[in-house]
């Protein structure tokens, strides 16, 4: 059928043009967590730099107590990296002690909260099992997507278990958004 | 106060307008590497196609000598994906033989290099043990993030042990980045 | 040589300017898979949920049948994660046992499918040996990057093994793309 | 658990500013959206607008627009309302509400009548 | 502003009797809230996102629906479900309700 080719290519204007260089975008890095109360079933969200080092946020986008705020509604491309560290969890060990076999595990979570719905939801996870045979182990989980966005919308990245979260290097655990 | 709410997204257009066509990008792909000298303390860096199959540079975006040359100011994505393979790393064998329980472990870092540093700088790094139980292992790992780049600045991708990467096909590793 | 040296940054308009929110862009999200025939040595290729929870697609961008249909050529950015789990690959015993010592992989790679090329082209492959020690393990692969695709172009994910793919959450295996 | 208790003044004068306060506990409220909502007598709700704790960033009701003021004071976990200019029209019990970050919970309301 | 329009006004119906309350906006949206309102109480929510049970809502209560036209289900009414239910529209500019539906026990 002829309605299922593509429209032509050479109209494109439908929406008003703007400037790249004025986008809502952000790059956040991470700090040494401090514990802070959560519910019992919500992971705990992480804090992070805004300002400092590779840290920044332009165009409207702004970072406060643990989530960056949408200026502005569209698409937007949201990533996040955390490194985890831990000492090892001995799944054989475990098993053999008569544990139950379900492994450790380690999760991020990149949230949304928007006032338009009552529960907070998961955008992207990331999660895998840990069983390490060696003593100290270290690994990275990253998580890119993009989304549509409300103006007035809020992102957080929530982890299984901050004490496992490498703090120590900016370029190791981030979190960041760009409007496309 | 009212001022608090979202300035009206109307107000649009604080920059020149930009054709998305013209603006850098690249994707560079793995080559096999020829060992290089590098610094006793300092991650050695792979060199990479940029012109046949998958690998293009356009729009001044240049490679050269290992580097990705940013041709002008302005934030940018980078990302990068690396494929490690390698003979086991035997951690509990290695814990019974009385060596030091550190397990081995396999590093990316993107790295900028700029003319107002003294220091290049770690944008980007992954960093994951490696303990295996099975002979031979191989595993990918992958970054991405913004950054804020300045006409000059160069791009390069480090790793902890180039013999341990797979540039068998372009697919599996890779490096680019692009203008927002 | 002078010819060498930057363009002025300037001259920056040599393409139709083109409204962002017109841009073709998908996300896709996981939805349970029904068995399908597939070549006997091409990994299968997973199918996709485009409008309900936080899939979309927009902008002429069309999913059909496994694939996303590229409506306009350009540079996009393309991206995919895939959960992998599965009951433990148990390589020492494996070995014991005399079995090849080849571990067990799991391998995501995003395809495009071109009619100007007979076979299918891998942009790009996560593979990663699976060697538990644990019983129940699960893992993400990730992959994103850019490439010139042509209008007409079909993109999909295959993987090696459907039955290990996580179908339970929409956040943990997705897949998309969009013009830059 | 979670729990919202608005307070204020039960009668305002013709022409004055209603003022009242939203005070939460039970969760951090930052992690929500706190939103205003009226029902005048023998009528329906009105949603009069909404503030984001953690940024202060606030969304109106066009039709109060000109009259309504909310804020946020999160050393002590409040939210504040402020109506200017009442007339006998907005005599109404008055519900703050929270959404986003948890279950939607709304406060048990508060009576304002405007009268001299 | 979108204006949402609810129907019935009130009705009167027996214990395990089926209810339906329909809703209808002035234009599209993505998604309809409805709540419950006892007399002197607080509105609670019911159904969240169309067709979302609320933490805690027996599951007589349902929601379905798209676009302009949605509608609320109790499947068994029950004593304790005597009140006024209200949709509401979160995505326009104000938020608006629906002018309620008082439910009342023959």
């Known amino acids: 059928l002829k309605g299922q080719e593509f429209a032509p290519s050479h109209q494109q204007v439908y929406a008003p043009l703007r400037a790249d260089g004025d986008k809502p975008r952000a790059h956040l890095t991470v700090v040494r967590q401090t514990p802070t109360q959560h519910f019992k079933n919500q992971f705990p969200a992480l804090h992070w730099e805004h300002e400092l080092g590779l840290a920044f946020t332009k165009n409207r986008m702004n970072y406060t107590n643990k989530f960056l705020l949408i200026p502005e509604s569209g698409d937007y491309f949201i990533y996040s990296q955390v490194t985890f560290r831990g000492m090892t969890s001995e799944c054989s060990e475990i098993r053999q002690a008569g544990r139950p076999n379900k492994p450790d595990s380690i999760t991020v979570v990149i949230t949304k909260v928007t006032d338009s719905y009552p529960e907070p939801t998961q955008l992207l996870m990331g999660t895998k099992s840990v069983c390490e045979v060696g003593s100290n182990w270290f690994q990275p989980i990253y998580l890119g997507a993009m989304f549509s966005l409300q103006e007035g919308d809020k992102l957080m990245v929530n982890v299984s278990d901050i004490s496992l979260v490498d703090y120590t290097k900016e370029d190791k655990t981030f979190f960041g958004a760009f409007l496309l | 106060l009212k001022g608090q709410e979202f300035a009206p997204s109307h107000q649009q257009v604080y920059a020149p307008l930009r054709a998305d066509g013209d603006k850098p990008r690249a994707h560079l792909t793995v080559v096999r590497q020829t060992p290089t000298q590098h610094f006793k303390n300092q991650f050695p860096a792979l060199h990479w196609e940029h012109e046949l199959g998958l690998a293009f540079t356009k729009n001044r975006m240049n490679y050269t000598n290992k580097f990705l040359l940013i041709p002008e100011s302005g934030d940018y994505f980078i990302y990068s994906q690396v494929t490690f393979r390698g003979m086991t790393s035997e951690c509990s064998e290695i814990r019974q033989a009385g060596r030091p329980n550190k397990p081995d472990s396999i590093t990316v870092v993107i790295t900028k290099v700029t003319d107002s540093y003294p220091e290049p700088t770690q944008l980007l790094m992954g960093t994951k043990s490696v303990c295996e139980v099975g002979s031979n292992w191989f595993q990918p790992i992958y970054l991405g993030a913004m950054f804020s780049l300045q006409e000059g600045d160069k791009l390069m991708v480090n790793v902890s042990d180039i013999s341990l990467v797979d540039y068998t096909k372009e697919d599996k590793t890779f490096f680019g980045a692009f203008l927002l | 040589l002078k010819g060498q040296e930057f363009a002025p940054s300037h001259q920056q308009v040599y393409a139709p300017l083109r409204a962002d929110g017109d841009k073709p862009r998908a996300h896709l999200t996981v939805v349970r898979q029904t068995p399908t025939q597939h070549f006997k040595n091409q990994f299968p290729a997973l199918h996709w949920e485009h409008e309900l929870g936080l899939a979309f697609t927009k902008n002429r961008m069309n999913y059909t049948n496994k694939f996303l249909l590229i409506p306009e050529s350009g540079d996009y950015f393309i991206y995919s994660q895939v959960t992998f789990r599965g009951m433990t690959s148990e390589c020492s015993e494996i070995r014991q046992a005399g079995r090849p010592n080849k571990p067990d992989s799991i391998t995501v790679v995003i395809t495009k499918v071109t009619d100007s090329y007979p076979e299918p082209t891998q942009l790009l492959m996560g593979t990663k040996s699976v060697c538990e020690v644990g019983s129940n393990w699960f893992q993400p692969i990730y992959l994103g990057a850019m490439f010139s695709l042509q209008e007409g172009d079909k993109l999909m994910v295959n993987v090696s093994d459907i039955s290990l793919v996580d179908y339970t959450k929409e956040d943990k295996t997705f897949f998309g793309a969009f013009l830059l | 658990q979670v729990q919202l208790q608005e307070s204020g003044p039960g009668l305002v004068r013709p022409s004055q500013t209603l003022s009242l306060t939203c005070t939460v506990s039970?969760?951090?409220?930052?992690?929500?959206?706190m939103h205003w909502v009226r029902q005048r007598p023998g009528r329906g709700l009105e949603w009069m607008g909404r503030?984001?704790?953690?940024?202060?960033?606030?969304k109106y009701n066009p039709s109060l627009k000109s009259r309504v003021t909310i804020t946020r004071d999160t050393s002590k976990n409040q939210v504040s309302l402020r109506l200017s200019s009442v007339t006998a029209a907005d005599t109404a019990v008055y519900y703050c509400?929270?959404?986003?970050?948890?279950?939607?919970?709304w406060g048990q309301g508060s009576l304002v009548t405007v009268s001299s | 502003d979108i204006q949402m329009t609810q129907s019935p006004s009130s009705l009167s119906a027996s214990v395990g009797d089926r209810v339906t309350i329909t809703c209808r906006a002035s234009?599209?949206?993505?998604?309809m809230y409805w709540y419950q309102q006892k007399p002197g109480k607080a509105p609670k929510l019911l159904i969240y996102?169309?067709?979302n049970l609320a933490s805690g809502v027996p599951s007589r209560f349902s929601g379905s629906g798209s676009g302009t036209d949605f509608t609320f289900t109790i499947s068994s009414l029950q004593p304790e479900d005597i009140a006024t239910y209200y949709c509401?529209?979160?995505?326009?500019?104000?938020?608006?309700f629906g002018q309620g539906t008082k439910v009342e026990i023959k």
């Open positions: 509400a929270v959404s986003g970050g948890m279950p939607d919970v």
């Open positions: 039970g969760f951090d409220y930052q992690d929500t959206y």
């Open positions: 503030i984001d704790p953690a940024s202060g960033h606030t």
């Open positions: 234009q599209g949206v993505e998604y």
């Open positions: 996102a169309t067709s």
């Open positions: 509401q529209q979160w995505e326009g500019n104000p938020r608006t």
